[in-house]
């Protein structure tokens, strides 16, 4: 029996998730856990409930989804802790040393735990059909369950690198882990592509003092772009880089800024528009930057937020370590850059030390950036 | 009783392999992850990695990947480790262990193999 | 990965004697996954404390340990002849779990 539809998720306050699919008892799960670089995942509230719940939807595990799931989670009552009637988590407490978010934003209780203040006692994710959390059920330590989440904390990450270019990327990265939205990438995490003329090009996402940043790349794309423009970090020509009012679209390529006319690229210190462009209508204002789209600021911090909530501080078990994984791959042509799997299994390194094999997989998209990695 | 039985002293060339086994009993084998631990002579213990039988999902230590394999016969409850590409730095006493409650400390060895290359 | 680091690496205590040897990482280890083993040439390690200051099965009362973070401590009340051996920290808060390089307690 093998792990066959493993998943995992991350949010952009630096915090990702796996879901794994393998009868365990409670124990082994922590174990794996770890073994992973992470531990076994609180689901305490807010944007940390919403990131399981989105790998959950991604799809049923080995099954099918005919029936219901059990998923370890950090959630344990302690030996000469009492069952609390009135609490939303009835005297069970998340094992980490997080502080507490709003523990009445919590899942259910899908049967009231056993009224006792002497043995302890574990708790599991319930999950209808495998991929609707229906709440939480006590459950003995001892017994397995069908699967298990864990979590793992970043301090920083790396945007995601713009293709230009590039096709054929594929990705590598720390613990099953992927986001496919490509939003960001934890450090550890390998993306190579083809550039023009089917040249290899490979860059590690790395941490240092500073932050987190792209090792080996030059420049703010994987591969270069032959003309001026880009359009969601890829090469386009000027005729693609209108929107559907008419605006201005594109962001110019390294080496040229935007034009006085606020719809075209030209060389950089020319200040005139050397290509055609100057009758097409714009709704919108001029860009005082080198390029009309927002760059992105990096290397981001967790920090940073990137917009979002940030889900709790990084928690007692923290991740550094290198398991191994699955090669995941995008076609360039895709406009989202979705991705699809290759069935091998590769290893990567992450910032310190273990590696983790057996993984068949490919994916599909969820929100937020859940990833599939069941058998092919 | 739980009981982890290894397999005997083993002399080899370098650049050969080597394949040791650990056998267990009194213990549901394929609940709980075997780790494997090298000592060097006076030396202190590395912890090598790790193999869960029941899915035979593994862990390395960065370390030894590539130069140990682990796997395991659930059939037989043995757990085996082979070392490939000897070298005088693999001789060592390696030991197999696992965790049975006590918050993965390693609370069962086996007795150790010894390699000497 | 985390380092821990023993001192003193040798240690002579007389019979009777109060010893203590430390145990410091790298970076914050949790107390759960901090544990000690005892060694004796040729043979395996043994458990000896488990969780930071839990004693195994079979380990007498005299061996307690403390700590918490980056610092922990292995302490014998009144040392006995059996006690001569290697003791080994171990972390498994972070993978890869990792050993300290132990310390040899002596007969003086």
């Known amino acids: 029996e093998h792990p066959t539809a493993d998943r995992a998720g991350c949010s952009a306050s630096g915090a990702c998730y796996s879901l794994h699919h393998a009868t365990m008892k409670r124990q082994a799960a922590e174990e794996a856990c770890i073994l992973r670089g992470g531990a076994l995942s609180t689901v305490r509230a807010g944007a940390e409930l919403r990131a399981v719940l989105a790998l959950l939807r991604a799809g049923p595990g080995p099954g099918g989804g005919s029936k219901d799931l059990l998923f370890w989670v950090a959630l344990e009552r302690r030996r000469s802790h009492c069952t609390l009637e009135n609490e939303p988590l009835r005297g069970f407490s998340w094992l980490s040393s997080d502080p507490g978010g709003l523990e009445s934003d919590t899942l259910q209780w899908v049967e009231e735990p056993q009224r006792s203040c002497t043995a302890r006692r574990c708790a599991v994710l319930q999950a209808t059909g495998g991929v609707e959390p229906a709440g939480w059920k006590e459950m003995r330590c001892h017994l397995r369950a069908n699967g298990y989440l864990c979590k793992y904390q970043f301090e920083v990450l790396c945007p995601a690198p713009r293709p230009g270019a590039a096709s054929n990327l594929s990705y590598r990265a720390p613990f099953q882990l992927h986001s496919a939205a490509l939003d960001f990438s934890p450090p550890g995490t390998e993306v190579s592509a083809l550039c023009r003329g089917q040249l290899p090009i490979s860059v590690t996402c790395i941490a240092d003092e500073i932050g987190a940043r792209w090792d080996k790349l030059s420049g703010d794309v994987l591969c270069p772009c032959p003309g001026r423009y880009l359009r969601a970090g890829k090469c386009a020509e000027l005729p693609n880089c209108l929107d559907d009012l008419g605006g201005f679209a594109c962001e110019c390529a390294t080496g040229f800024e935007l034009g006085k006319d606020g719809r075209s690229c030209v060389t950089s210190g020319e200040g005139q528009p050397t290509l055609g462009g100057t009758g097409v209508p714009t709704r919108r204002p001029p860009a005082t930057a080198t390029s009309p789209v927002p760059q992105r600021t990096w290397p981001i911090r967790v920090d940073e937020k990137l917009g979002e909530t940030p889900l709790v501080p990084e928690q007692d078990n923290s991740v550094t370590s290198i398991p191994e994984i699955p090669r995941w791959g995008s076609q360039s042509t895709m406009s989202t850059l979705q991705m699809s799997l290759q069935a091998e299994s590769k290893a990567t390194i992450t910032p310190s030390g273990s590696v983790i094999s057996k993984f068949n997989s490919t994916t599909s998209s969820a929100t937020p950036q859940a990833f599939d990695s069941s058998s092919a | 009783e739980v009981q982890l039985q290894q397999s005997g002293t083993v002399l080899a060339r370098p650049g050969a392999s080597v394949k040791m086994s650990c056998k267990a009993s009194g213990y549901t084998f394929t609940s709980y992850w075997m780790h494997w631990v090298k000592q060097r002579p006076g030396q202190g213990l590395e912890w090598i990695g790790a193999i869960y039988p029941g899915n035979s999902d593994t862990s390395y230590n960065q370390k030894f990947k590539g130069k140990a394999k682990l796997t395991a016969v659930t059939s037989t409850s043995t757990a085996y480790m082979e070392l490939s590409s000897l070298t005088n730095e693999d001789s060592a006493v390696f030991y197999c262990?696992?965790?049975?409650?006590?918050?993965?400390?390693?609370?069962?060895w086996g007795q150790g193999t010894s390699v000497t290359v | 990965q985390i380092v821990l680091t023993q001192s003193p690496a040798i240690m002579s205590a007389s019979l009777g004697e109060r010893v203590t040897m430390t145990c410091t990482a790298s970076s914050s280890v949790s107390s759960s996954y901090l544990h000690w083993y005892q060694q004796k040439p040729g043979s395996s390690p043994k458990l000896w404390i488990y969780s930071t200051s839990n004693l195994a099965s079979g380990v007498p009362a005299r061996f307690s340990g403390s700590g918490s973070g980056t610092s922990y401590s292995l302490t014998i009340s009144s040392m006995e002849a059996e006690d001569a051996a290697t003791y080994y920290c171990?972390?498994?808060?972070?993978?890869?779990?990792?050993f300290g390089g132990g310390t040899k307690l002596e007969i003086k």
């Open positions: 262990t696992h965790y049975y409650g006590s918050d993965y400390a390693m609370d069962y």
């Open positions: 171990h972390q498994y808060h972070r993978s890869p779990r990792t």
